[in-house]
């Protein structure tokens, strides 16, 4: 019989969504083409289930790691990259004293046991988000 | 493969001027900052400061401000440090090194070094 | 600018005996995101510093697993669980919490 496999190799399972981990770094906007060109998006978190999660994969690897967020269009205004704003509910997730825009921090990475705004230039790892695939019927 | 290779030796003289390079490969420049650190004949590990490749902000350790100045070319993939007022005490080997900020900060790929003599 | 301190300076060893180096910060590297910004570097005879160590405990990736991180706040270990002969050098420890970096005197392994 066929199983069905709602998310590629590599990419991890959770509440509907497909999830992949990068193993090496790009600059935040590079992060972005790296994954629209797996047909999927730097993470937007929509829950707070799901920032859990992410913010779990993250710190357990102990790597420091691009989402899909930004004030690049406007400083002190947070967006997500499918143009949503952020929630002010969501920014209890910054570390303490973040974001502080030191020299121009323009893009939020998953750090340690929070998010950190840093430079957009800098080469990190990142995580792409796609929907998982039907496997009913 | 990631490398950094620096200039060679030099002689200098007191009071005259040094400029080290530092030519990055197998990676992108722009991603990661580039610091200076020195070694004294014998001694320990000195920080002099970084640059960041992409926009060239500099931060530099308060001993060496005024007297060392960090630049790169992005077209050319190189970093340069050069340092002025040259004592006796500045002789040293001088290292570039790549900060990965995928892993904190870490100084994960060095250059090999470059001897810098300061003698009269 | 926050000082470093190593011990022991000089650290004699046995092949397949364990060893181990204190590093000491003046003010903790403790960091609001959780992670201690301490690392680890070994500079063989001859040779440009390598990395072992980074956030404190964190092997970086082809360093081999008889060595070791731990610590928090003020005060680190780095621990050889087996030493090997390719283990000498001068191990030194660098906080990167804050500019300027600064790292420890180093201590010099030497196999007895």
């Known amino acids: 019989e066929r199983l069905c496999h709602p998310c590629p190799w590599e990419w991890t399972f959770f509440q509907g969504n497909c999830y992949f981990m990068s193993n090496s770094q790009r600059n935040w906007h590079d992060s972005i083409t790296a994954c629209q060109e797996v047909g999927a998006q730097l993470v937007v978190i929509k829950s707070a289930e799901e920032q859990n999660f992410l913010q779990l994969q993250s710190s357990r690897s102990n790597r420091f790691t691009w989402m899909g967020l930004s004030d690049l269009n406007h400083e002190g205004t947070w967006q997500w990259v499918d143009g949503s704003p952020l929630l002010p509910s969501f920014k209890q997730y910054w570390n303490k004293g973040e974001p502080n825009n030191v020299g121009e921090e323009d893009c939020a990475e998953f750090s340690g046991n929070g998010w950190n705004d840093d430079k957009c230039n800098l080469a990190k790892f990142w995580i792409c988000k796609k929907s998982a695939a039907s496997c009913s019927g | 493969q990631v490398q950094l290779v620096q200039s060679g030796a030099e002689v200098k003289k007191p009071g005259a001027s040094v400029k080290v390079s530092c030519k990055a490969s197998?990676?992108?420049?722009?991603?990661?900052?580039i610091n200076w650190v020195r070694q004294a004949p014998g001694q320990g590990l000195e920080w002099m400061g970084w640059?960041?490749?992409?926009?060239?902000?500099?931060n530099y350790a308060q001993k060496f401000q005024g007297r060392v100045t960090m630049t790169r070319d992005p077209s050319i993939s190189t970093a340069y440090m050069e340092l002025s007022r040259l004592r006796s005490d500045d002789t040293a080997v001088y290292y570039c090194?790549?900060?990965?900020?995928?892993?904190?900060?870490?100084?994960?790929?060095w250059g090999q070094g470059t001897l810098v003599t300061v003698s009269s | 600018d926050i000082v470093m301190t190593q011990s022991p300076l000089s650290l004699p060893g046995t092949p397949g005996e364990p060893a181990s180096i204190s590093c000491r910060s003046s003010?903790?590297?403790?960091?609001?995101?959780?992670?201690?910004?301490l690392d680890w570097y070994l500079q063989k005879p001859g040779q440009s510093p390598q990395f072992l160590i980074y956030?404190?405990?964190n092997r970086a990736s082809g360093v081999p697993d008889r060595f070791s991180g731990s610590g928090s706040g003020t005060d680190f270990t780095l621990k050889i669980s087996r030493v090997e002969a390719e283990d000498v050098g001068v191990y030194y420890c660098?906080?990167?919490?804050?500019?300027?970096?600064?790292f420890g005197q180093g201590t010099k392994l030497e196999i007895k």
């Open positions: 660098m906080q990167a919490l804050q500019t300027p970096y600064t």
């Open positions: 090194a790549r900060e990965n900020s995928g892993y904190g900060k870490l100084f994960d790929y």
């Open positions: 640059i960041n490749p992409n926009s060239g902000d500099t």
């Open positions: 003010q903790s590297l403790l960091h609001s995101n959780g992670y201690n910004y």
């Open positions: 197998g990676y992108t420049f722009t991603g990661y900052y």
């Open positions: 956030l404190g405990s």
